[in-house]
Interface confidence: low
């Protein structure tokens, strides 16, 4: 099967896992390391770049450990001694949840991203080309582990949402209530957390993430699509994601899909050409059986301005259109906080996104 | 190396009941899908449910649904299937197969993952 | 239901032959369908799936093709350990998999 060029990925690999890098590092390679803190046993796991099996010589140890208030530690082992520790004493990691860990190699550094946000920057101390070997041990199981070669073009860069010299702080939000859409549904006091309005550069493709504190709408020129974001923490019951937006002229169709992995666990599809709204579930690359009802007519209108709310819930997604209720889509996916990445595409243009 | 190894089969009166076991080994039953597959004697394959436990998603065939339950221990990193109402038509080899969890490119390269390991099988007799 | 018609439900075939097995799905399943071998008393082992990807360690003799809802197994050379009950399955929702009826290739 094709990879376009890049090594084939480890698939569900039992921890601790020790596996080859073929043709060691290089510049511009990016190893994504897709798993989930187990909640029970343990309160470290470790990713090693590594030269060998031996674990004597560790170009790079990424060691999250859930203790004293949780903390990161990297460092380099040569000939089984180990270096200064760097501390980073902020914890993205939370046990018994999903993560992607992403490691970009440079020439000067390895960029470390947690759930598609910068997280360190670890200036090599031995050469990196030493590297042929990732091992990853400790309390974790692994999805996966795959390789994107510096040579390839993914669609989706998972570097591309922030750039390196940004890097992103998230302060807690403040207590109290979160603005909503007049009068839908029951206003659910959401649980203090991190809500992200997402706003774009000038440059094209330059996205990054800004606190929002509280939600409001910012001026600024359209996103770029498709629009890929994460949503940190996933779904939960109260989590709220708002969008709003114009649907292009000549508008055929446009989504709103809400992804666990390599699945869409909820698939929002205005069909201009159907005059329908067609709501599924994407599991291994297949569709279900789609849900088209409304109470209403199609609330879409071609070269009309729109907002969308999608309120999670226990059992269901509430999805409103221009503050009024339209339909409740069953959790077909019922693990939420792995739903976890947003994407929109289509005809449309995006003014605003918060998860 | 990858492993499933069913065990819990035997003989049943019909309108009892029978749990399946699948023991994995060399993979993470959680980042996978588990997945039965009977085959009656002398008979071709007949899938009967399915389980990611990452996702928290599981489905039945309609032959089997409202009678049996697939779950999984990701701790001990087994699958099961409880079987109750059994019927004499139930009787068959049941396998647990795996079906990989996999890199979100792959999706974008239009790759459909099917049942790589298998389980050796093992035999439910419901008769009276 | 998605429906699996598999055809011949079996077949003679002599060491070398070509051999062509096909399998109609009654809507579309993309390219959502993989083969299986079997043998008596054993488990089926993958040998395709995507409709036309190879799994790691099967020969090369093996391949599988998609032309619509109409899809194919060929063995280009059959060999001895060939003689088997092939079946294809498709998975294009996780509630809808179905396998074929199967097709056993005996020696002639």
């Known amino acids: 099967m094709a990879f376009s060029g890049s090594q084939a990925p480890y698939l569900s690999p039992a921890v601790p896992f020790s596996g080859t890098i073929q043709g060691g590092l290089q510049d511009g390679l990016q190893i994504t390391v897709n798993g989930t803190v187990l909640s029970s046993s343990g309160t470290r796991f470790a990713v090693n770049f590594q030269t060998g099996f031996s674990g004597n010589d560790i170009a790079f140890h990424f060691n999250p450990r859930f203790e004293d208030g949780g903390y990161v530690v990297c460092n380099t082992r040569q000939n089984g001694s180990w270096g200064p520790e760097e501390r980073k004493t902020h914890m993205p990691f939370q046990k018994g949840m999903p993560f992607d860990l992403c490691f970009l190699v440079q020439s000067s550094d390895f960029k470390v991203m947690v759930n598609g946000i910068l997280f360190v920057q670890y200036f090599h101390r031995v050469p990196f080309h030493r590297v042929d070997t990732i091992s990853v041990n400790g309390s974790v199981q692994l999805s996966y582990i795959s390789f994107q070669n510096p040579r390839t073009v993914p669609v989706q860069p998972a570097f591309s949402t922030v750039p390196f010299s940004q890097p992103v702080c998230f302060p807690p939000r403040p207590r109290g209530r979160r603005q909503k859409p007049p009068g839908v549904w029951p206003a659910n006091p959401a649980p203090i957390t991190q809500t992200v309005i997402h706003t774009v550069q000038s440059a094209p493709g330059q996205m990054f993430s800004t606190p929002a504190i509280p939600p409001m709408m910012y001026p600024h020129p359209a996103y770029p699509m498709p629009f890929i974001t994460t949503i940190l923490g996933g779904l939960y019951p109260s989590k709220s994601i708002l969008l709003s937006g114009t649907v292009l002229p000549s508008a055929q169709r446009f989504h709103i899909n809400l992804c666990s992995g390599n699945h869409i666990a909820f698939h929002l599809n205005p069909r201009f050409d159907e005059n329908a709204v067609v709501r599924n579930t994407q599991i291994d690359n297949s569709w279900g059986s789609e849900e088209r009802s409304l109470p209403r007519k199609m609330p879409f209108v071609r070269g009309q301005s729109f907002s969308v709310w999608i309120l999670c819930e226990a059992h269901c997604l509430k999805v409103a259109v221009d503050g009024q209720h339209l339909f409740e889509y069953y959790h077909r996916l019922r693990n939420l906080p792995t739903i976890n990445r947003l994407e929109v595409g289509g005809d449309i243009q995006l003014t605003h996104v918060q998860t | 190396e990858v492993q499933l190894v069913e065990s819990g089969g035997g003989l049943v009166q019909p309108g009892g009941s029978l749990r399946l076991s699948c023991a994995a080994s060399?993979?993470?039953?959680?980042?996978?899908?588990i997945h039965w597959v009977r085959q009656a004697p002398g008979k071709g394959l007949e899938w009967v449910a399915s389980i990611y436990p990452y996702y928290g998603y599981t489905s039945y065939a309609d032959s089997v649904k409202g009678r049996f339950t697939i779950s999984a221990d990701t701790s001990k990193n087994t699958a099961y299937l409880q079987m109750n109402s059994l019927r004499a038509e139930d009787t068959a080899v049941y396998y647990c197969?795996?079906?990989?969890?996999?890199?979100?490119?792959?999706?974008?390269?239009?790759?459909?993952?099917?049942?790589?390991?298998w389980g050796q099988g093992t035999l439910v007799t419901v008769s009276s | 239901d998605i429906q699996m018609t598999q055809s011949p439900s079996s077949l003679s075939a002599s060491v070398g032959d070509r051999v062509t097995i096909t399998c109609r799905a009654s809507q579309s399943v993309s390219s959502a369908v993989a083969w299986y071998q079997q043998k008596p008393g054993k488990a089926p082992k993958l040998l395709i799936y995507s409709a036309s990807s190879l799994y790691s360690g099967v020969p090369s003799r093996f391949s599988g093709s998609r032309s619509g809802t109409d899809f194919t197994l060929t063995i280009s050379s059959l060999q001895p350990e060939d003689f088997a009950t092939y079946y294809c399955?498709?998975?294009?929702?996780?509630?809808?998999?179905?396998f074929g009826q199967g097709t056993k290739v005996e020696i002639k």
């Open positions: 399955q498709q998975s294009y929702f996780p509630s809808l998999v179905t």
């Open positions: 197969a795996r079906k990989i969890f996999w890199p979100v490119s792959w999706m974008w390269q239009g790759y459909y993952p099917a049942l790589d390991y």
């Open positions: 060399g993979f993470t039953v959680y980042s996978s899908s």
